[in-house]
């Protein structure tokens, strides 16, 4: 057992195995579930993070109003499939051969069906809105320290570009995070803005994914934020494709 | 725990070289980042690219060295910055430093080099 | 993104008081670091995390900011101290900028 050994571990996604085995001796940590390699120096794709944990043991309006395209995840967890590359394959079935297409981020954008089902294309999810509900506080926050301490948290903790944080929306008690990330802007490299809304919804819930870390002790001017409720809405590159009489 | 860059010296213009980062006392397994920075005779600091050396593999590079240099880690004791191209611009002393954190827009670099000197002369 | 330092050199007299500045033209939080260098030596890091002492380092040496403006103060100066000084941030890298400031050189009299 070496020190390198010791070293050896995944900062940033602990449902990992990690060895010293990879080329040259190297440290190399594949996920839970899929035994895809990872890289550790950033977030792993939520492909592969649903994969690992359904592998695991079970135990004058300033805010934004979400568009009629929007998409919530309401079908909650399910075992995906996922590309070599990690992203989730824009055809997902379940073990009864029910079959749905997904975006970017994994959420259903169609009705179910069968496997006759095509999916043509993996649709990006290009505007995450995050919004949520803080618990009360002697008074408001600052809006634009909020704005700021959000901004600092989506860099530091799940390195996501500040570019990448199109708005902070604030009325108390509730705040909105807006994530803007179109396929042009995204660079090799950069953080995909439904891995970090994903690694945040966690760590929210008290879930958090990074190794040996804390939970998020998000403070404003020293004053603790605490979140009751969060909703996420998805809005996809093009429209998803539901029959009338789910929405009615 | 140390660094030392191997690979300097005298190259002609338009000519190539590799400079070798090796560590001693510690490995290059960790969840770090591993840097190539440079500086001129009289001049500031400059940042050429970055390598993460955990698991992954990682690379940043400066918009002026995208294309003309590649760095690369193939074993966990060494890492290596290929120059292809080079011009008289590129005169310079080569460190490379050690980050000391797994976050790279958290990074600060506790451990650096000697450096090794490049001169690009006909 | 970039980072400006000023002065781009400064003499004070030994046991006077030297304070020098780095302005990032966008916001970097508490993410800079402060080196001094010595010629013929490679920099060593004095403060990380714009007002954290590094290991070793006298604490005549103070860093302060947050944000876009940042100041390193080294007081009771010392013969020793004189050197060439660089902030650095990595917190824009992936835009592929420089994220050293351009050096101060401290002269001790």
């Known amino acids: 057992h070496t020190a390198a050994q010791d070293n050896c571990t995944c900062p940033t996604n602990k449902m990992t195995v990690c060895s010293p085995d990879g080329p040259g001796g190297r440290c190399q940590c594949r996920a839970l579930g899929s035994g895809m390699a990872v890289d550790c120096s950033t977030l792993t794709s939520k492909c592969l993070l649903l994969k690992a944990r359904m592998s695991a043991p079970k135990n004058a309006r300033t805010l934004v109003r979400p568009s009629e395209h929007a998409l919530v995840d309401n079908d909650g967890l399910y075992d995906p499939d996922c590309d070599p590359e990690g992203r989730f394959k824009a055809r997902q079935c379940n073990q009864t051969s029910v079959c749905w297409c997904v975006n970017s981020v994994g959420v259903r954008r169609t009705d179910k069906g069968d496997l006759s089902l095509r999916c043509d294309e993996l649709v990006r999810t290009h505007h995450i809105l995050i919004d949520l509900r803080h618990r009360p506080t002697a008074g408001a926050f600052n809006h634009s320290d909020l704005d700021a301490e959000l901004r600092r948290l989506f860099r530091e903790r799940y390195r996501l570009h500040p570019k990448f944080v199109a708005a902070v929306h604030y009325e108390q008690p509730t705040i909105q995070i807006e994530l803007r990330q179109n396929t042009s802007q995204k660079a090799a490299g950069d953080v995909d803005i439904g891995d970090a809304a994903y690694y945040f919804e966690r760590d929210i819930k008290g879930e958090s994914l990074f190794q040996g870390r804390g939970g998020l002790d998000l403070r404003v001017r020293g004053e603790p934020l605490q979140v009751e409720r969060t909703l996420i809405y998805y809005l996809d590159e093009i429209p998803p494709k539901f029959s009338m009489k789910r929405l009615t | 725990q140390q660094l030392e860059e191997s690979g300097g010296g005298l190259v002609k213009p338009e000519g190539s070289l590799t400079l070798t980062c090796k560590g001693s006392?510690?490995?290059?397994?960790?969840?770090?980042w591993m840097w190539w920075v440079r500086q001129a005779p009289g001049k500031g600091l400059e940042w050429i690219a970055?390598?993460?050396?955990?698991?992954?593999?990682?690379t940043y590079y400066a918009s002026w060295a995208k294309g003309r240099f590649t760095i690369s880690s193939t074993s966990s004791t060494a890492v290596t910055l290929q120059a292809t191209s080079l011009t008289a611009a590129d005169t310079a002393t080569y460190f490379c430093a050690r980050g000391a954190t797994n976050n790279v827009f958290m990074n600060y670099f506790n451990l650096w080099g000697p450096g090794t000197l490049v001169t690009v002369s006909s | 993104f970039e980072m400006t330092q000023t002065p781009s050199s400064v003499s004070e007299p030994v046991g006077g008081t030297v304070t020098i500045k780095c302005q990032a033209s966008?916001?970097?939080?508490?993410?800079l670091g402060w080196y001094q260098q010595k010629p013929g030596q490679p920099p060593k890091l004095l403060i990380y995390g714009a007002s954290t002492l590094a290991s070793g380092v006298p604490s005549r040496f103070k860093g302060s900011g947050s944000g876009t403006e940042f100041t390193l103060t080294i007081s009771d100066l010392e013969c020793a101290d004189a050197a060439t000084y660089y902030c650095?941030?990595?917190?824009?890298?992936?835009?592929?900028?420089?994220?050293f400031g351009g050096g101060t050189e401290v002269v001790v009299k």
């Open positions: 966008e916001d970097i939080s508490s993410n």
């Open positions: 970055c390598i993460y050396v955990g698991s992954g593999s990682s």
């Open positions: 650095q941030t990595s917190y824009y890298i992936d835009d592929g900028v420089n994220g």
């Open positions: 006392g510690f490995d290059f397994s960790g969840t770090y």
